[in-house]
């Protein structure tokens, strides 16, 4: 992963059977925020285990999480987004383990979308554009994006480019001619909010032009 990734849970170094990780997503459904948690050990028996968040909430003292298979989540407008909340794993009324977390430090943005690549014959380059729902958001507006591309035959040889805008130009001479490429993009908070990389966007696939033998230039696609 990248040096941008940060762990909002570092202050709780104690690892036991019930250690867990969480991420928040702000304005993920209109004005609703979400908080998603899971046990770090996938084999924990979660049958009677519940999650609860208390503190730094609006109008209520605590909220209970809903459970979906192995994950726990809340969707609410009631996060204050100032100060730390206490998130606890509980069996009945008994807390097994708790973490104090500032929800603004564990933000995972939504994945970018509408990724596309257009070849400009005259300029001998490829213009990469994509969209992000965060342009319309009130809170997490400023993101760093990681565009990754590879020749399809090179399984794990990704080239990464970090950028703050949603447009990137790839020079034709930097790519192999007559080759199939896969490209994808993800985002991470980059101003005030901290957290984790988003999921990758859906991949876009494109082919580079052939080389024109007489001039040594690529033929258009």
């Amino acid at each position: 992963e990248s040096g941008y990734a940060q762990n909002g849970d570092l202050e709780d170094a104690e690892l036991d059977d019930y250690s867990f990780s969480c991420y928040s997503q702000l304005e993920v459904n209109g004005s609703q925020h979400s908080l998603t948690c899971a046990f770090e050990d996938p084999d924990v028996n979660i049958t009677n285990l519940e999650f609860e968040i208390c503190g730094a909430l609006v109008e209520v003292k605590c909220l209970n999480f809903r459970k979906l298979q192995e994950i726990y989540f809340i969707e609410t407008k009631k996060f204050l987004l100032i100060g730390k909340s206490n998130i606890c794993v509980k069996v009945g009324e008994k807390s097994l383990t708790c973490k104090k977390i500032d929800l603004t430090t564990i933000v995972k943005p939504e994945a970018p979308f509408d990724l596309s690549v257009v070849y400009r014959e005259g300029a001998n380059d490829f213009v990469v554009t994509f969209n992000t729902s965060h342009l319309q958001k009130k809170y997490v507006k400023v993101l760093m994006h990681d565009v990754a591309y590879r020749q399809e035959k090179d399984e794990n040889k990704w080239t990464h480019v970090n950028l703050s805008s949603t447009k990137l130009t790839l020079l034709q001479r930097k790519l192999q001619p007559a080759a199939m490429y896969e490209i994808k993009v993800r985002s991470i908070p980059d101003h005030y909010f901290k957290g984790f990389w988003s999921e990758w966007s859906p991949s876009y696939y494109f082919r580079t032009p052939e080389i024109n033998n007489s001039s040594g230039e690529m033929d258009p696609i």
């Epitope: 192995e70 994950i71 999921e199």
Partner: nanobody
Framework: QVQLVESGGGLVQPGGSLRLSCATS????????MTWYRQAPGKTREFVAA???????TYAESVKGRFTISRDNAKNTMDLQMDGLKPEDTAVYYC???WGGGLNRAPFDYWGQGTQVTVSS
């Protein structure tokens, strides 16, 4: 190793409908994004539709208003309802399940073998 199996492809007339399904052979992390891609003969693979665990869907411009993606988190399955099919929808349709990492789960990227959809009169 998780296997993805697509079904529901076939031959259909223009304007007709098909429903593709994608089933996973094993347990996958519930937060994984599920995606449909397609590849027509001689063309590059292209994105069709994706759905997150909470049901947020995105579509390629070419299928908006005609295709509907859905998923069942309890069964780890995904469907693609395709209405108003056109000859240009002819392709092999692939199911993809992806998790980028985090929450102490390793990243994964699983693909199905594909199911053929042919739209022709």
């Amino acid at each position: 190793q998780v296997q993805l199996v697509e079904s529901g492809g076939g031959l259909v007339q223009p304007g007709g409908s098909l429903r593709l399904s994608c089933a996973t052979s094993g347990s996958i992390f519930s937060l994984a994004t599920m995606t449909w891609y397609r590849q027509a003969p001689g063309k590059t693979r292209e994105f069709v539709a994706a759905i997150t665990w909470r049901g947020a869907a995105t579509y390629a411009e070419s299928v908006k208003g005609r295709f509907t993606i859905s998923r069942d988190n309890a069964k780890n399955t995904m469907d693609l309802q395709m209405d108003g099919l056109k000859p240009e929808d002819t392709a092999v349709y692939y199911c993809n399940v992806k998790w980028g990492g985090g929450l102490n789960r390793a990243p994964f990227d699983y693909w199905g073998q594909g199911t053929q959809v042919t739209v022709s009169s």
